[in-house]
Interface confidence: low
């Protein structure tokens, strides 16, 4: 005889940590290993992300949840969930498609990520470089000549640096 | 549902900048990465970079780095790209693309062309 | 960069065929691979990430495979609707780098 069928989905109770297995008269069957289903009345189970190579493992896999991976030392994470990890780099340099590169003169980068930024131009505000700058550090710009009296030593803090990676605007 | 709706075609002169925008709505801003890829006529998809729309840093692939900037406004949920100093091979369709292991959604795209 | 390199270029097909596309990667990218579907004047959409995992709402009829260097997408019984331009991407590292594009046409 032809069974009734359920009005309600019998997938639907069917909780994470398993799937509705239409080859089973949609049964509720565990996620098979490697693989997970964060919620309820899945049909099929998520393959748990791998953390190869350059990745590294910061949680393991469970049959509700996927791993969670970052990156090894030397790399550091990009994007939600770290779905990159990108090579670091020392202060003064930039990483090129060749590799870690020093910053070019007139350039500095203060982080491990990120590309060499120009220093500061401080005869645009009419201010005197008060100290150089190097690859690691931007120049401090200082009151110019001019504006100096008796008296005054007032320093101006450099700018705000930009976000880490932008390019100059 | 998750939507992306950038901002619509321009013509620029060579020399000028470009300032591209995609909205996102339907979901979390925060919670994925926006990356931008373009298609000149006729040609395959180029990655051009993405932003953690969290931090607001930026990754720009290496033939874009000093003429691409990425930007974002969480309280409006918009990313940005601009792209400056054009020239006529950047004639093309700009797509921006939520990321979350793959480019899983996509803006219409915004057709850029180049011309004097 | 990893190289994605994808065949054929183009091919003909009839409704119902079964079609192969495949993507060779130039380094190992583990499974760190997506194919999206192309109309013209159209976005691309995700069809496959992590190799064989269908995005939402993708027809079982396509399905993805491979891991290391070797991917292949497979249309079981190619529809109407299916001609279209195909792009395999690996994200294993960055750059992301997409491959060159599969043209499929009416034959």
């Known amino acids: 005889f032809e069974r009734t069928r359920s009005l309600q989905d019998p997938c639907s109770n069917c909780p994470a940590g398993t799937f509705c297995d239409n080859n089973r008269n949609q049964i509720c069957s565990p996620c098979p290993p490697n693989s997970f289903s964060s919620a309820g009345g899945q049909r099929t189970c998520d393959i748990c992300r791998q953390c190869k190579g350059v990745f590294r493992t910061r949680k393991e896999c469970s049959s509700t949840s996927n791993a969670e991976c970052d990156c090894t030392p030397g790399f550091h994470c990009l994007g939600a969930g770290c779905s990159m990890c990108e090579q670091d780099c020392k202060q003064g340099q930039e990483l090129t498609k060749k590799g870690c590169k020093d910053c070019c003169f007139g350039t500095f980068n203060d982080q491990k990520r990120g590309i060499c930024r120009p220093w500061t131009n401080c005869s645009l505000d009419g201010k005197s470089v008060l100290v150089n700058g190097t690859k690691e550090r931007d120049v401090v710009c200082g009151p110019s000549p001019a504006d100096l009296s008796p008296g005054a030593s007032s320093v101006t803090p450099p700018a705000p640096a930009r976000e880490p990676g932008h390019s100059p605007q | 549902q998750v939507q992306l709706v950038q901002s619509g075609a321009e013509v620029k002169k060579p020399g000028a900048s470009v300032k591209v925008s995609c909205k996102a709505s339907g979901y979390t801003f925060t919670d994925y990465s926006m990356h931008w890829v373009r298609q000149a006529p006729g040609q395959g998809l180029e990655w051009m970079g993405w932003i953690n729309t969290e931090t607001g840093e930026p990754t720009y692939a290496d033939d874009f780095k000093g003429r691409v900037t990425m930007t974002r406004d969480t309280s409006i949920s918009t990313a940005y790209m601009e792209l400056s100093r054009l020239r006529s091979d950047d004639t093309a369709v700009y797509y921006c693309?939520?990321?979350?292991?793959?480019?899983?959604?996509w803006g219409q795209g915004t057709l850029v062309t180049v011309s004097s | 960069d990893i190289q994605m390199t994808q065949s054929p270029s183009s091919l003909s097909a009839s409704v119902g065929d079964r079609v192969t596309i495949t993507c060779k990667a130039s380094q190992d990218v583990s499974s760190a691979v997506a194919w999206y579907q192309q109309k013209p004047g159209k976005a691309p959409k995700l069809l496959i990430y992590w190799a064989s995992i269908r995005h939402t709402g993708v027809p079982s009829r396509f399905s993805g495979s491979g891991s290391g260097t070797d991917f292949t997408l497979t249309i079981s019984s190619l529809q109407p609707e299916d001609f279209a331009t195909y792009y395999c991407?690996?994200?294993?590292?960055?750059?992301?780098?997409f491959g060159g594009g599969t043209k499929v046409e009416i034959k």
């Open positions: 991407q690996q994200r294993y590292t960055t750059p992301p780098t």
């Open positions: 693309a939520r990321y979350d292991y793959a480019m899983d959604y």
